[in-house]
């Protein structure tokens, strides 16, 4: 019996495969064989089916990195690790997904969720977009929406200084942050941990963090979970 | 071209209440928190109350929380400010604007103003 | 609440003069800082979003500054339809407040 997605472009059509433990997938951009990227899918969260693109943990990974670090990604995806900016477009440019950020801290959770997500490419200087808030951390991405990723060596933002030098991280900053979910792990000095300003304020850096993406038209396809 | 017009001002006792409206033009309304800002004649300006895109969410200045409801229709492109329990304070020009794009952002776009004079 | 604290409160100044009025906040505000103009029986204009950006059609002689407490809006050559008074506004935190405003007149 084959699968119903022999070669899933996501987390979701490998749930839909019948694959319901979280941890390291094989997905296809695009469908395509020859386009294979490795993946952490989240399957427990919120019904699943989430490609987890940004983890923050315990701070063993360096975070304060250039441009071609965020565009092609780094680190562990089993610890904590950058997916790659390259990546994300690829991925978002699929169809209509949706982002999810999950945050901890000592016993306590919150997250966002976010209808319309996407990423765009090299040279729109992967323009983010950002819509439609739900949650319990509250809409602190809003204030990103729009923006091109900024590095310490590419500076897209708009602020007189570099957002990315004066908060030693990267982001879709503005001028500079809500949200900074790449900021010094540990670092409770104003706006320079990992922060999401309407759960926590900027003088307190989070322990845990994901972002994760999915299909936004998720739900109507969970009735399909079963092979073929 | 973005407009925004506000009405309901007027004359009105203290401890009387008073509904304003703003009518929101040239631009996709629901896209955009919106605010209401007063100013006391001769005085300053102070923020009164904000409400997200959606209506979803909510905030007042403690000089104004629970006694002012913000709301607003999406379907009508308008935003309100029902005020109750109004006190002297109270009176100034009235001010709605828009934000630039989120929540707690720069105000890009002003109306002209409704006026509010508490008074016995 | 963030207090916004705003020198001089009146600036007396020539035609062609450059202006500088410094805006401070009570507590650290990132770059969350805007500037508007407004003239009698008008509503408020903005000028300057995020610290430093320009608002579109205004005119170049407006420049901002700063960051983290301490802003500063500049105007570099005074024009007569710039007599008005000036507030600076944090929009890094609800309440979002003002300054108590700096009214720019005729010397």
């Known amino acids: 019996i084959g699968l119903l997605y022999p070669f899933p472009r996501d987390c979701s059509q490998a749930m839909l495969n019948g694959d319901t433990t979280s941890g390291l997938y094989t997905i296809y951009i695009n469908g395509d064989k020859t386009q294979a990227l490795e993946v952490y899918c989240d399957m427990t969260s919120d019904g699943g089916g989430w490609i987890v693109f940004l983890r923050r943990k315990n701070g063993r990974e360096d975070f304060y990195r250039n441009w071609k670090a965020y565009a092609t990604g780094f680190g562990d995806r089993r610890e904590e690790f950058w997916l790659g900016l390259d990546n994300l477009s690829k991925i978002t440019a699929q169809g209509q997904y949706e982002l999810r950020v999950d945050l901890q801290d000592h016993g306590e959770s919150a997250y966002a969720v976010y209808d319309r997500f996407s990423v765009g490419d090299a040279k729109s200087r992967y323009k983010l977009k950002v819509e439609g808030y739900s949650g319990t951390a509250g809409d602190s991405m809003n204030y990103h929406n729009g923006r091109s990723f900024s590095t310490y060596d590419k500076d897209t933002d708009s602020a007189i200084t570099n957002c990315a030098l004066s908060y030693k991280g990267a982001f879709w900053y503005k001028n500079c942050h809500r949200v900074n979910l790449m900021g010094r792990y540990g670092d409770n000095n104003h706006s320079q941990g990992v922060n999401w300003f309407h759960w926590k304020g900027h003088e307190y850096s989070i322990q845990f963090a994901e972002m994760k993406l999915r299909p936004s038209n998720f739900r109507n396809l969970e009735g399909r979970r079963k092979r073929a | 071209q973005v407009q925004l017009v506000e009405s309901g001002g007027g004359l009105v006792q203290p401890g009387r209440s008073l509904r304003l409206s703003c009518a929101a033009s040239g631009f996709t309304f629901d896209d955009y928190a919106m605010h209401w800002v007063r100013q006391a004649p001769g005085k300053g300006l102070e923020w009164v109350s904000g409400?997200?895109?959606?209506?979803?969410?909510?905030y007042y200045a403690d000089s104004v929380k629970g006694r002012f409801t913000i709301s607003r229709d999406n379907a009508k492109n308008s935003l309100y400010l029902q005020m109750n329990s109004l006190r002297a304070e109270d009176t100034a020009l009235y001010y709605c604007a828009k934000v630039m794009s989120s929540m707690e952002d720069a105000f890009d776009i002003w109306g002209q103003g409704t006026m509010v004079t508490v008074s016995s | 609440d963030i207090q916004m604290t705003q020198s001089p409160a009146s600036l007396p100044t020539p035609v062609g003069d450059r202006v500088t009025i410094t805006c401070r906040a009570s507590q650290y505000i990132q770059g969350f800082l805007n500037w508007y103009q407004q003239k009698p029986g008008k509503a408020p204009k903005l000028l300057i979003y995020d610290a430093s950006n320009l608002e579109t059609g205004v005119p170049s002689r407006f420049s901002g500054s700063g960051s983290g407490t301490d802003f500063t809006l500049t105007i570099s050559s005074l024009q007569p339809e710039d007599f008005a008074t000036y507030y600076c506004?944090?929009?890094?935190?609800?309440?979002?407040?003002f300054g108590q405003g700096t009214k720019v007149d005729i010397k």
């Open positions: 409400i997200s895109g959606s209506g979803g969410s909510t």
């Open positions: 506004q944090q929009s890094y935190s609800t309440p979002q407040t």
